[in-house]
């Protein structure tokens, strides 16, 4: 049975041209994390493999930085970066846990971080 939950930075906002850290944390499971994938809609942004380290998608290398930890830093934000981001934890033996973050990139300087909150996890087994 999968007991884990993913806590994320939740709904967040940031200024155009600025940067933002996307963070997820997997808790309540002893499963081994083998890989974390960061995705935006239908695009893979980055992979952090437990054995092999970080690998950033070539199309995002100039704007995405690994970390801190298993998180991801998005830089030089544009309004087009607004949308859903997913952290996908591949674990053994549990399977896959998914966390969702919604980022809104604002034109104005009135950008505030949403409160950290816990979301239900979506999952499937390998």
């Amino acid at each position: 049975m999968m007991t884990g939950t993913i806590e994320t930075t939740g709904n967040i906002s940031a200024e155009k041209g600025g940067s933002i850290i996307l963070q997820c944390h997997l808790s309540s499971t002893t499963a081994q994390v083998t890989q974390v994938n960061w995705e935006q809609q239908d695009q893979l942004l980055a992979i952090c493999n437990a054995d092999l380290g970080w690998h950033i998608s070539p199309s995002f290398k100039d704007r995405v930085a690994p970390g801190p930890g298993l998180g991801l830093t998005l830089q030089s934000l544009t309004v087009n970066d607004t949308g859903e981001y997913f952290c996908i934890y591949h674990t053994y033996p549990d399977g896959t846990y998914t966390g969702r973050i919604f980022l809104e990139v604002l034109e104005s300087s009135v950008a505030e971080h949403g409160a950290r909150f816990q979301i239900p996890h979506h999952h499937h087994h390998h």
């Epitope: 890989q35 994938n37 239908d42 695009q43 893979l44 380290g53 690998h55 998608s57 070539p58 499937h124």
Partner: antibody, heavy 117, light 107 residues
């Protein structure tokens, strides 16, 4: 110019081991992964495992765990794949490839390994 | 493991005509799919990565599309030098599995 040059063809008896080398040149060896892929006659390409030469971290396909060892020598920019307890089904062409974000942008020329009694 | 299923197994197309190869992943792989061309006696060559990005030096008659589980490689106008076996590969998670290959020939 990026190049991956592999060692020559090998003929081995069942139960023996084989060690294939892959010498990289033309790029920073520790900045990319080295992946190993094989193709048995009439079969699809099969990923075997990978090494990060910078960290030494490895990841193997489950079916090869305990039988394959991938290593890298930073001083000579050479990666090695050793496969033990060889059987006839291991007869294949073995390729090393440079891994960029887990796809393979440069490949070695291939090393034919024949396992026969 | 993620299973990559290619179709068709083989394809005969007239010179100058379009060739379309499909690849289906057994589970979600986002855009983590690459395509390779493999000619007899040669090493495979990378054509497409991240589903739709053409690799450096690859002719623009080759294009890729798809995301999630369904992917397509298209050769818009088949040339004689395109005769080969084409493989899809998922680079989403280890082990990095390949499709069974599609042999492209000239009709």
């Amino acid at each position: 110019e990026v190049q991956l040059v592999q060692s020559g063809a090998e003929v081995k008896k069942p139960g023996a081991s084989v060690k294939v080398s892959c010498k990289a040149s033309g790029y920073a060896f520790t900045n990319y992964l080295i992946e190993w892929v094989r193709q048995a006659p009439g079969q699809r390409l099969e990923w075997m495992g990978v090494i990060n030469p910078g960290s030494g971290g490895t990841n193997y396909k489950e079916k090869f765990k305990g039988r394959v060892t991938i290593t890298a020598d930073k001083s000579s920019s050479t990666a090695y794949m050793e496969l033990s307890s060889l059987r006839s089904e291991d007869t294949a062409v073995y390729y090393c490839a440079r891994g960029e974000y887990f796809f393979f942008d440069y490949w070695g020329q291939g090393t034919t390994v024949t396992v026969s009694s | 493991d993620i299973v990559m299923t290619q179709s068709p197994d083989s394809l005969a197309v007239s010179l100058g005509e379009r060739a379309t190869i499909n690849c289906k992943a057994s589970q979600h792989v986002s855009d983590g799919v690459a395509w390779y061309q493999h000619k007899p006696g040669q090493s495979p060559k990378l054509l497409i990565y991240s589903a739709s990005y053409r690799y450096t030096g690859v002719p623009d008659r080759f294009s890729g599309s798809g995301s999630g589980t369904d992917f397509t490689l298209t050769i818009s106008s088949l040339q004689a030098e395109d005769v080969a076996v084409y493989y899809c590969q998922q680079h989403y998670n280890t082990p990095h599995t390949f499709g069974g290959g599609t042999k492209v020939e000239i009709k």
